[in-house]
């Protein structure tokens, strides 16, 4: 079948990086500069993406693959194939229409992107707050208040694992 198809359609023989040139008797011609074809049998080459402005080139365009962009420092990619760049904020902030703003009390963001999220409500799980939340960190929930009644053993965090060959300080 492949052989018959290629007899019927000479364009199917054109490999990636070329196009089937109707103006030249359907000869396979190389893609012109700043264009590419990622599959065989193409009748045209696609224009390469240009990474300009807030975008910068992560991978140059070749005759067989499109350029890939990322964002300049201080920005991060959004969308498929980095279709958008968005400004980074500091931890403890979120990006609004007026720039980076601190998280409101009771919310936190531990990344340079995304929105401020509410602290975990420990009481919903019948637990108590072991470590208070901040703008940058969620609260840490501990055992329920009942577990902390007199006589109950207190919660102690596990000792940090020591690396082999290091003596305790």
């Amino acid at each position: 079948f492949e052989r018959t198809r290629s007899l019927q359609d000479p364009c199917s023989n054109c490999p990636a990086g070329t196009f089937c040139d109707n103006n030249r008797n359907q000869i396979c011609s190389p893609c012109p500069p700043n264009s590419f074809s990622s599959a065989g049998g193409q009748r045209t080459c696609d224009i390469c993406r240009q990474c300009k402005g807030v975008f910068r080139t992560r991978k140059e365009c070749s005759s067989t693959s499109n350029a890939e962009c990322d964002c300049t420092p201080g920005f991060h990619c959004l969308g498929a194939g980095c279709s958008m760049c968005e400004q980074d904020c500091k931890q403890g902030q979120e990006l609004t229409k007026k720039g980076c703003k601190d998280c409101c009390f009771g919310t936190f963001n531990d990344q340079k992107r995304g929105i401020c999220r509410p602290w975990t409500n420990c009481s919903l799980d019948g637990k108590s707050v072991l470590v208070n939340g901040t703008k940058e960190r969620d609260v840490v929930c501990g055992p329920s208040p009942a577990d902390l009644s007199p006589g109950a053993s207190s919660v102690t965090p596990p000792a940090p694992a020591r690396e082999p060959g290091h003596s305790p300080q």
């Epitope: 990474c51 402005g53 975008f55 300049t72 420092p73 958008m84 990006l95």
Partner: nanobody, 125 residues
Framework: QVQLQESGGGLVQPGGSLRLSCAAS????????MGWFRQAPGKGLEGVAV????????SYADSVKGRFTISRDNAKNTLYLQMNSLRAEDTAVYYC??????????????????WGQGTLVTVSS
């Protein structure tokens, strides 16, 4: 308080040149992107050029490529737009913008936080 002040607009003959300046105060200019936009009478806002620190090459609208050049002077906290071979269709109020929030590929998608008041460029014989 961030302030952007454009200057350098005026009346110029077709084929002539102008250099627009945008002085930024209260803004850490070097850490982000800045751009020039324009609004012709009765038209919407159009992206002209954007330049970013640490980025690739500046981005220009097709209508000004090869004629306009965007540049900046970090020491003076100033953005420039050199406009050559001016045409009647370049007549517009030109605005500078700073502190890019987010952007797609077309200049029209660039969302800036701060804007100047604008300077009028009239190209006429």
């Amino acid at each position: 308080q961030v302030q952007l002040q454009e200057s350098g607009g005026g009346l110029v003959q077709p084929g002539g040149s102008l250099r627009l300046s945008c002085a930024a105060s209260g803004y850490t200019y070097s850490s982000n992107c800045m751009g020039w936009f324009r609004q012709a009478p009765g038209k919407g806002l159009e992206g002209v050029a954007v330049i970013c620190t640490g980025g690739g090459s500046p981005s220009y609208a097709d209508s000004v490529k090869g004629r306009f050049t965007i540049s900046r002077d970090n020491a003076k906290n100033t953005l420039y737009l050199q406009m050559n071979s001016l045409r009647a269709e370049d007549t517009a109020v030109y605005y500078c913008a700073a502190d890019l929030l987010r952007a797609g590929t077309p200049l029209s998608s660039y969302e800036f936080n701060y804007w100047g008041q604008g300077t009028l460029v009239t190209v006429s014989s």
